[in-house]
């Protein structure tokens, strides 16, 4: 068996840095995606996103989203993503659980798949960065 | 204890190619970067690519696009590099190596292979 | 990709010396920076990593310090064992990019 080094104490400003370029490149990600003509969000999928049980950057489910964008990876070749879960990486903590995700069969229905969770996956980028600047200013007042 | 042991050294032909392994033991976790790196006599250290052996998802450098393949087993826990369509300057020791930590990405490769020596020939 | 300019190149200082290597990030990398010591014919040895944590079982006198995209490591009292070439090496995304490397010697 191996030990694990003492315990990495990651400034804040390191996560905010990581969080910003996973919002820019949700952006981008998202932009690619939506140049695909007649595809509708669907109900059927939905990204998990911020934990209410945890203090920022751990609130953020980052294993799942790694997950549903690695689906992505492998439905439609977005080198955007290769990025993003490197970024991802950087908040997912060694002994976290593997997400299973169910692959859609049909093309269009990949397709909505695809739409859905980039669409979320910003959506929640932002509101990652919100939670993690406010209680930045909590933590100073 | 964490070991990574690497095949032995190769002498090959321009044009062939090469594959190199890398065993690790005592090491328990998934999520992690093994990376692979080579040094060419006299040079310094050059980044050639990364694998994340839990998927076999890889990343490469440009550089060696198209020529280096690395793979992963999970199941005897080694991974490959092979690097095709060899040539004189591709003479060097190749190493690989990987991370110590509580994240997924890497800050710091912590165990290195004792390195593998290959030598191009003809 | 990210380039890690390191210098100097090579350097020459006496024993008990205060010695800095300095690498420049070509755009910011947060503290995703590592110092690995390579003494010839050996495989590299990680010292500092996370930019200024210091790997297991090196000695004090190795030190690492960030500043912007500047990146430092600092031998506080040069020994003859340190003779060595010392690289750094960025996390930030791959290509994980490697310094040029600074070869330390004795006078």
């Known amino acids: 068996s191996h030990t694990l080094p003492v315990r990495l104490l990651r400034p804040s400003d390191d996560v905010q840095k990581i969080v910003e370029e996973l919002q820019s490149l949700s952006k981008m990600l998202l932009k690619d995606v939506e140049e695909e003509k007649g595809v509708l969000v669907s109900q059927n999928y939905t990204l998990p996103c911020l934990s209410p049980d945890a203090q920022p950057p751990n609130n953020i489910h980052s294993p799942a989203i790694r997950a549903y964008l690695k689906t992505i990876r492998q439905l439609d070749n977005k080198s955007v993503i290769d990025e993003i879960i490197e970024h991802l990486d950087k908040l997912i903590f060694q002994d976290a659980p593997e997400t299973n995700i169910s692959v859609p069969t049909d093309t269009h229905e990949c397709k909505r798949f695809i739409l859905t969770i980039s669409q979320q996956f910003s959506e929640c980028m932002d509101l990652a960065l919100k939670s993690l600047t406010s209680g930045a200013q909590q933590a100073t007042t | 204890q964490v070991q990574l042991v690497q095949s032995g050294a190769e002498v090959k032909k321009p044009g062939s190619s090469v594959k190199v392994s890398c065993k690790a033991s005592?090491?328990?976790?998934?999520?992690?970067?093994m990376q692979w790196v080579r040094q060419a006599p006299g040079q310094g250290l050059e980044w050639m690519g990364a694998?994340?052996?839990?998927?076999?998802?890889?990343r490469y450098s440009q550089k060696f696009k198209g020529r280096v393949t690395i793979t992963a087993d999970k199941s005897t826990s080694t991974a490959y590099m092979e690097l095709s369509s060899l040539r004189s300057e591709d003479t060097a020791v190749y190493y690989c190596?990987?991370?110590?930590?509580?994240?997924?990405?890497?800050?710091?490769?912590?165990?290195w292979g004792q390195g593998t020596t290959v030598t191009v020939s003809s | 990709a990210i380039q890690m300019t390191q210098s100097p190149s090579s350097l020459s200082a006496s024993v008990g010396d205060r010695v800095t290597i300095t690498c420049r990030a070509s755009r910011n990398i947060g503290n995703y920076l590592a110092w690995y010591q390579q003494k010839p014919g050996k495989v590299p040895k990680l010292l500092i990593y996370?930019?200024?944590t210091s790997a297991s079982g090196v000695p004090s006198r190795f030190s690492g310090s960030r500043s912007g995209t500047d990146y430092t490591l600092t031998i506080s009292s040069l020994q003859p064992e340190d003779v060595a070439t010392y690289y750094c090496?960025?996390?930030?995304?791959?290509?994980?990019?490697f310094g040029g490397g600074t070869k330390v010697e004795i006078k």
């Open positions: 694998i994340y052996p839990g998927e076999g998802d890889t």
């Open positions: 090496q960025h996390f930030w995304s791959t290509p994980w990019t």
């Open positions: 190596a990987f991370p110590e930590g509580q994240y997924a990405a890497p800050y710091g490769m912590h165990y």
């Open positions: 005592g090491y328990t976790r998934t999520r992690y970067w």
């Open positions: 996370y930019a200024k």
